[in-house]
Amino acid sequence: MMTGTIETTGNISAEKGGSIILQCHLSSTTAQVTQVNWEQQDQLLAICNADLGWHISPSFKDRVAPGPGLGLTLQSLTVNDTGEYFCIYHTYPDGTYTGRIFLEVLESSVAEHGARFQIP
């Protein structure tokens, strides 16, 4: 039975040209995490596999850094990076847990005026 829960940073915003850390945390389970995928709906960004280490998609290799931990750092943000990001935890014996983060990348002037999503 899957007892775990994924905690995420929820809805976040960042400035164009800046960076952001995407972070998820799996709790309430003793299941072993064997792999974590970071994805958008239509493509993989990165994978952290317990045996193979990190794989970063070539489409993102210049702008994505692994970590901290099982998280992912997105750099040199553009408005096109706005959207939904998913962390997929592959675990044994529970199975797969999925969390989602919505990122809005704001023009610097807008960000400076304090437009922010509330984190639930």
């Epitope: 995928n37 709906q41 993989l44 994978i47 193979l52 794989h55 070539p58 997929i88 592959h90 999925t98």
Partner: antibody, heavy 118, light 107 residues
């Protein structure tokens, strides 16, 4: 239990449009996931056509981009495929399927055969 | 597009045998490969995702392995009901693409 069911005409004339409906039961298409159309040609080759997400975003196979449209009717929990300017090469069994991020296509309809012929 | 190649269109085996089906990706797809079983007259059934993870309810005689460009799907002890076509699919990036299929024939 999640179920998907394709429906639509089994015969379409060349140059016309192919229109199919996928009716989903047991899960709301606005709750989560990407809702896809996949076809299988007579030689068994499988071809992903496109999807509409729970939020209404669409993505299409570039090979079909100028001819394909996927829409939905949330009140009926249905999503639709429209393929314009069909030729005999579009003869295939058409499936609708649900995809979960980080995985493959987890639920499939039973498929509907569409023949393009004069 | 990422091309998924299943080099064997047909494989012949006997009940109780171990059989392995291979799939090669045209570029590194890490572990983002799924496997499906399609029996005659039915829609594809998902068996494996992320190269080696079985879906709930899939018998443990079915296993997947591999990473990068080379992937293997193995049935440890073939049963008569395993007569089917098996497909690999990459879920790395759109357009999501499938292998051409390997038809398992039981002697």
């Amino acid at each position: 239990d999640v179920q998907l069911q394709e429906s639509g005409p089994g015969l379409v004339k060349p140059s016309q449009s192919l229109s199919l409906t996928c009716t989903v039961t047991g899960y709301s298409i606005t709750s989560d996931y990407a809702w896809n159309w996949i076809r299988q040609f007579p030689g068994n080759k499988l071809d992903w056509m496109g999807y509409i997400t729970y939020s209404g975003d669409t993505r299409y196979n570039p090979s079909l981009k100028s001819r394909i449209s996927i829409t939905r009717d949330t009140s009926k929990n249905q999503f639709f495929l429209r393929l314009n300017s069909v030729t005999t090469e579009d003869t295939a069994t058409y499936y609708c399927a649900r995809r979960e991020v980080g995985q493959g296509f987890t639920y499939w309809g039973q498929g509907t055969l569409v023949t393009v012929s004069a | 597009d990422i091309v998924m190649t299943q080099s064997h269109k047909f494989m012949s085996t006997s009940v109780g045998d171990r059989v392995s089906i291979t799939c090669k990706a045209s570029q590194d797809v890490s572990t983002t490969v799924a496997w499906y079983q399609q029996k005659p007259g039915q829609s594809p059934k998902p068996l494996i995702y992320s190269a080696s993870y079985r879906y709930t309810g899939v018998p443990d005689r079915f296993t997947g392995s591999g990473s990068g460009t080379d992937f293997t799907f193995t049935i440890s002890s073939v049963q008569a009901e395993d007569l089917a076509v098996y497909y690999c699919q990459q879920h790395y990036s759109v357009p999501w693409t499938f292998g051409g299929g390997t038809k398992l024939e039981i002697n």
